[in-house]
Interface confidence: medium
């Protein structure tokens, strides 16, 4: 267009700019090795390094791995972004007792209000449940499970929330009290697909990083890229996304070009040894409840949780035989892998059918 000529001319003779006909304006030419963050960059700050997927560009311009929320007690709060790590928080039904950078080092189950008390403020990812005395006239039997949560035998001590992954506990010393609560938590996970699709589809170009228009001829690539499975951290460093490839882990949130993947223990397992964005060791839940009843969803949490059956209906928890024999699964559609080593230290209750998978590892059937 002739009328564009004056604008185009302003770019000539200025090696740091080029004319983009699509937007009809002069654009800043990103230096070699940097990519534009927009179609027509205007200034040096519109250019940056590129990192592999699951890495983000940190404040020091370094590609750094996003944290993963792969521990069984964590969920992703905010995704891995090009300039910030993924942020994890305690999963529904739990709160954070020991915080960590972009995550939580230790999550505890929300306390259950004891008899005669009702929930004043439901627990959140940051705070425990707050209880208050029940109004006069409310039966201790608590007709409404929403207002009064009566403890079942074997539930967690009311005064103390139960940690899901004690820092120093070995699998054999993991707290097995609170089986009902653990069962509720395990059951609640079944509302989610146990495996989310991997984000690493190995795209030929990274849509989160590539400019909408190719770099002008001769300008070279205009910002930093990272290899798949890496993300660009806040400092512009390509950092590895954590991997959920262990058979006892599932991907919670995908690896993005600017944030790490997060992993968590498979449904039916809890994290015995935590790791950033992941879990170093998953162990089976010590499930003791043979039956649960659905409870309305928490206000702040979206996963369905489960209420224990009435007091006195709690079955005994009988460990499976030492040799690992257990009834065959009758519902193969939703099975949960269990670490074979961990299953030796934590009994799998007979109320949860176990079958051996083709790998020889027991498969805990969710029913």
């Amino acid at each position: 267009f002739p009328q564009d000529r004056p604008f185009e001319d302003t770019c000539h003779g200025n090696p740091s700019h080029y004319y983009d006909k699509a937007v009809r304006r002069c654009c800043y030419r990103c230096p070699m090795g940097l990519f534009p963050t927009q179609q027509c960059p205007q200034r040096p700050t519109d250019c940056r390094k590129q990192c592999e997927p699951d890495y983000y560009l940190d404040e020091a311009d370094r590609c750094t791995a996003c944290v993963t929320c792969s521990r069984d007690d964590l969920v992703e709060k905010t995704p891995c972004a090009w300039n910030s790590s993924r942020v994890c928080e305690c999963r529904p039904g739990m709160f954070c007792s020991t915080s960590a950078v972009n995550s939580c080092a230790r999550c505890f189950f929300h306390s259950v209000c004891p008899a005669g008390m009702i929930v004043k403020f439901p627990g959140t990812a940051q705070k425990n449940t707050v209880c208050e005395p029940a109004s006069p006239g409310v039966s201790p039997a608590c007709a409404s499970p929403e207002n009064c949560k009566e403890p079942s035998s074997g539930t967690i001590p009311q005064a103390k929330p139960t940690p899901v992954s004690p820092a120093t506990s070995s699998a054999s010393t993991m707290p097995v009290r609170g089986g009902t609560r653990l069962a509720q938590e395990a059951a609640s996970k079944l509302t989610r697909a146990p495996d989310s699709p991997s984000s690493v589809g190995r795209p030929s170009s990274d849509p989160g990083l590539s400019p909408t228009q190719p770099c002008p001829e001769g300008s070279g690539d205009c910002r930093k890229q990272c290899e798949p499975d890496y993300y660009l951290d806040e400092a512009g460093r390509c950092t590895a996304c954590v991997s959920c490839s262990r058979d006892d882990l599932v991907e919670k949130t995908p690896c993005a070009w600017n944030s790490s993947r997060t992993c968590e223990c498979r449904p039916g397992m809890i994290c015995a040894t935590s790791a950033t964005n992941s879990c170093a060791r998953c162990v089976p839940y010590p499930i003791c409840a043979a039956e649960t009843v659905t409870k309305p969803q928490d206000m702040a949490e979206k996963d369905t949780t489960f209420e224990a059956p009435p007091l006195g209906t709690q079955p005994d928890c009988n460990p499976t035989p030492e040799n690992g024999e257990a009834p065959a699964s009758t519902s193969p559609t939703q099975s949960l892998l269990v670490d074979s080593q961990a299953s030796k230290t934590l009994p799998i209750p007979t109320s949860a059918p176990v079958a051996l998978s083709s790998t020889g590892k027991p498969v805990l059937d969710a029913g």
């Epitope: 993963t68 190995r202 590539s210 690539d221 950092t239 590895a240 954590v242 959920c244 262990r246």
Partner: antibody, heavy 118, light 107 residues
Framework: QVQLVQSGAEVKKPGASVKVSCKAS????????IHWIKQAPGQGLEWIGY????????DYNQNFKDKATLTADKSSSTAYMELSSLRSEDTAVYYC???????????WGQGTLVTVSS | DIVMTQSPSSLSASVGDRVTITCKAS??????VAWYQQKPGQSPKLLIY???TRHTGVPDRFTGSGSGTDYTLTISSLQPEDFATYYC?????????FGGGTKVEIK
């Protein structure tokens, strides 16, 4: 199956340049970045840099920014590393390697020995 | 750059021995640590990644562990084919960096 096949050994004089190739097969070449790693005789491993064959985007270890140039030819599924201004300390085995989705350096080339000697 | 300090640099052991190699990162690498085995004249072979995940086909006598800055490779019962040099690597941040290596020799 995935294979990375490197070019043969080279003997070069100081000051010269050498171009090592790494031919990929068994997968879509543009889907994975190619890394290059140096191993001097009797020494450990040193990451040189990587290239995204899809866009030819490269990033280097600062120690190799003025030494190595990485390129890729999509038509032949081959990655190249050119080493310039060779010195005796550049004598090493150079490997190309590829990551798997979650896995660092799951696949390696057989290595190319570059000897710099007057 | 992240420095990976590996120890010991060499060790002598017998078949059946339990061998432990450690690697210390100069900063937290969020379990993004891999271990490789290399035999003379061969390319390195991936054993462990993400600190504790065994690569396909790697025998279960090889175990990786650790978090933060401290990582360990353990060979529970050394076999004749395990005599080699082992390297740790952080794949947490670019540039990737390797430990100096541990040569496992026959006693």
């Amino acid at each position: 199956q995935v294979q990375l096949v490197q070019s043969g050994a080279e003997v070069k004089k100081p000051g010269a340049s050498v171009k090592v190739s790494c031919k990929a097969s068994g997968y879509t070449f543009t889907s994975y970045w190619i890394h290059w790693i140096k191993q001097a005789p009797g020494q450990g491993l040193e990451w040189i840099g990587y290239i995204n064959p899809s866009s030819s985007y490269t990033d280097y270890n600062q120690n190799f920014k003025d030494k190595a140039t990485l390129t890729a030819d999509k038509s032949s599924s081959t990655a190249y590393m050119e080493l310039s201004s060779l010195r005796s300390e550049d004598t090493a085995v150079y490997y190309c390697a590829r990551r798997e989705d979650y896995v660092p350096f799951a696949y390696w080339g057989q290595g190319t020995l570059v000897t710099v000697s007057s | 750059d992240i420095v990976m300090t590996q120890s010991p640099s060499s060790l002598s052991a017998s078949v059946g021995d339990r061998v432990t190699i450690t690697c210390k990162a100069s900063q937290d690498v969020s379990t993004a640590v891999a271990w490789y085995q290399q035999k003379p004249g061969q390319s390195p072979k991936l054993l462990i990644y993400w600190a504790s995940t065994r690569h396909t086909g790697v025998p279960d006598r090889f175990t990786g562990s650790g978090s933060g800055t401290d990582y360990t490779l353990t060979i529970s019962s050394l076999q004749p084919e395990d005599f080699a040099t082992y390297y740790c690597q952080q794949h947490y941040r670019i540039p990737h960096t390797f430990g100096g290596g541990t040569k496992v020799e026959i006693k």
